[in-house]
Interface confidence: low
């Protein structure tokens, strides 16, 4: 008889999860010489150890510390790119601007990007049927705690001028409940970070408003300023042209506003 399994509201673990994590780890360590020392089997063991056999609504940041330790990586000053609700463009940008890094360009972020996982209390099984949903079930689930943990660490290690890409098409351009708003903003270290520069990405082609004057951006400016970090904001009116100009900065059309 099949054993009883807890039913959660969220989708289950991504199929071939262990194989995917291992394969991504191998890919990453081979492309990034500074991480060539990383033993991917140990990384998988630490990842697995964070959630296997544990009640999936009771995961803590402590559970992920062995994994975080193995994946320790530093980003050069001025090269950190945070993002909120605009992941695809942020990743397109760092694919072109190879010396800037989002969390998903780092080993741990790369391993887990777009994946879901959870286990079950007291069994060594991975639950491929369902996993806890952040809203409907619990916030201390394996996926949410993972991203909170690595996002905190990513922000803590940032230095110099930190950039953040924000989605100007959303009603809350800066959302205090996003990972950026609830975790990363509060873990930037004033003694290491001189400034936060927000890039507000416009959605509409004819949208010429100054979204840096948006009330939520003013709220972000207030939070950052109170932490003794300077704040700058830029409108990116034409994201397509912006990417094009990152690729070809000498293009004469790039001398005009983007």
């Amino acid at each position: 008889l099949p054993r009883w399994r807890q039913q959660w509201s969220g989708s289950g673990t991504t199929s071939r999860f262990p194989e995917t994590v291992l394969a991504r780890c191998v890919k990453y360590t081979e492309v990034h010489p500074e991480m060539r020392h990383v033993d991917c089997q140990s990384v998988w063991d630490a990842f697995k150890g964070a959630f296997i056999s544990k009640y999936p609504c009771n995961i803590t940041e402590e559970d992920y510390q062995p994994l975080v330790k193995l994946g320790t990586q530093t980003v050069p000053c001025n090269k950190t790119l945070l993002w909120s609700r605009i992941k695809d463009l942020a990743h397109q940008f760092t694919q072109v601007q190879r010396d800037m890094f989002t969390l998903e360009d780092m080993l741990l972020g790369y391993l887990a990007d777009d994946l879901t996982w959870c286990g079950e209390f007291n069994t060594f099984e991975i639950n491929y049927q369902s996993c806890p949903d952040w809203r409907k079930d619990c916030s201390n689930n394996p996926v949410s705690v993972f991203w909170k943990t690595v996002s905190r660490r990513f922000a803590e290690t940032a230095c110099g001028v930190v950039h953040v890409m924000l989605n100007g098409s959303r009603s809350k351009i800066f959302d205090k409940n996003s990972t950026f708003g609830s975790v990363e903003v509060h873990n930037l270290q004033p003694e290491k970070v001189q400034a936060l520069e927000a890039w507000v990405i416009h959605g509409g082609r004819e949208d010429s408003r100054d979204l840096c004057q948006d009330p939520t951006i003013k709220e972000l400016e207030s939070i950052i300023s109170k932490r003794n970090i300077r704040f700058f904001c830029k409108n990116i009116y034409r994201p397509d042209k912006f990417l094009q100009c990152v690729k070809n900065p000498e293009d004469s059309s790039c001398l005009s506003g983007i």
């Epitope: 394969a23 191998v26 890919k27 081979e30 060539r36």
Partner: antibody
Framework: QLLESGGGLVQPGGSLRLSCAAS????????MSWVRQAPGKGLEWVSD????????HYVDSVKGQFTISRDNSKNTLYLQMNSLRAEDTAVYYC????????????????WGQGTLVTVSS | QSVLTQPPSASGTPGQRVTISCSGS????????VSWYQQLPGTAPKLLIY???QRPSGVPDRFSGSKSGTSASLAISGLRSEDEADYYC???????????FGGGTKLTVLG
Amino acid sequence: QLLESGGGLVQPGGSLRLSCAASGFTFDDYGMSWVRQAPGKGLEWVSDISWNGGKTHYVDSVKGQFTISRDNSKNTLYLQMNSLRAEDTAVYYCARGSLFHDSSGFYFGHWGQGTLVTVSS
Amino acid sequence: QSVLTQPPSASGTPGQRVTISCSGSSSNIGDNYVSWYQQLPGTAPKLLIYRDSQRPSGVPDRFSGSKSGTSASLAISGLRSEDEADYYCQSYDSSLSGSVFGGGTKLTVLG
């Protein structure tokens, strides 16, 4: 599995197109390479191509002469060889690169059995 | 003339330990991984060692790889007659943007 075909006897200045049919793995996860071995000699890397065909590299001696390509929908790797010379005579191996989405470098985990190309008049 | 330098031949008796060296430069071995391949007569090469010292599954632990600076070596302990083959080192060369091989070492098992 990697299975090369298209080799044979060709006159100097002639052309050949080698194919390598891949099976048993996700072809578009891997960079692929061609490596050749002249009779009684050592291995020589010839060319590689990234997982999506976006990047290609060639050994200096075949630049402008050989073209590597791939058709991921057919799980097939190709090598178009033009202006062939006697020194291109070799067994040509198709080799699977390591698992990452950039270039095929670093190591070749699987090899085909090779196809012999003989350039002679 | 190969970019990576290997001795053309090596030999040993059954049970012995032999090592094959491979020297290069900072743009290949110094900065990148080294792999080793075994080629038995009349067959395609087979991967023995990758990422300097890792063994693929199925390769006996008698085979081991190491690297120091711009040189690498393959060690075979407990030599057997079936180890008689050509051995090639290989690395990626950053300045050439391509892979490079050593000239190969013919290993003879005596007796």
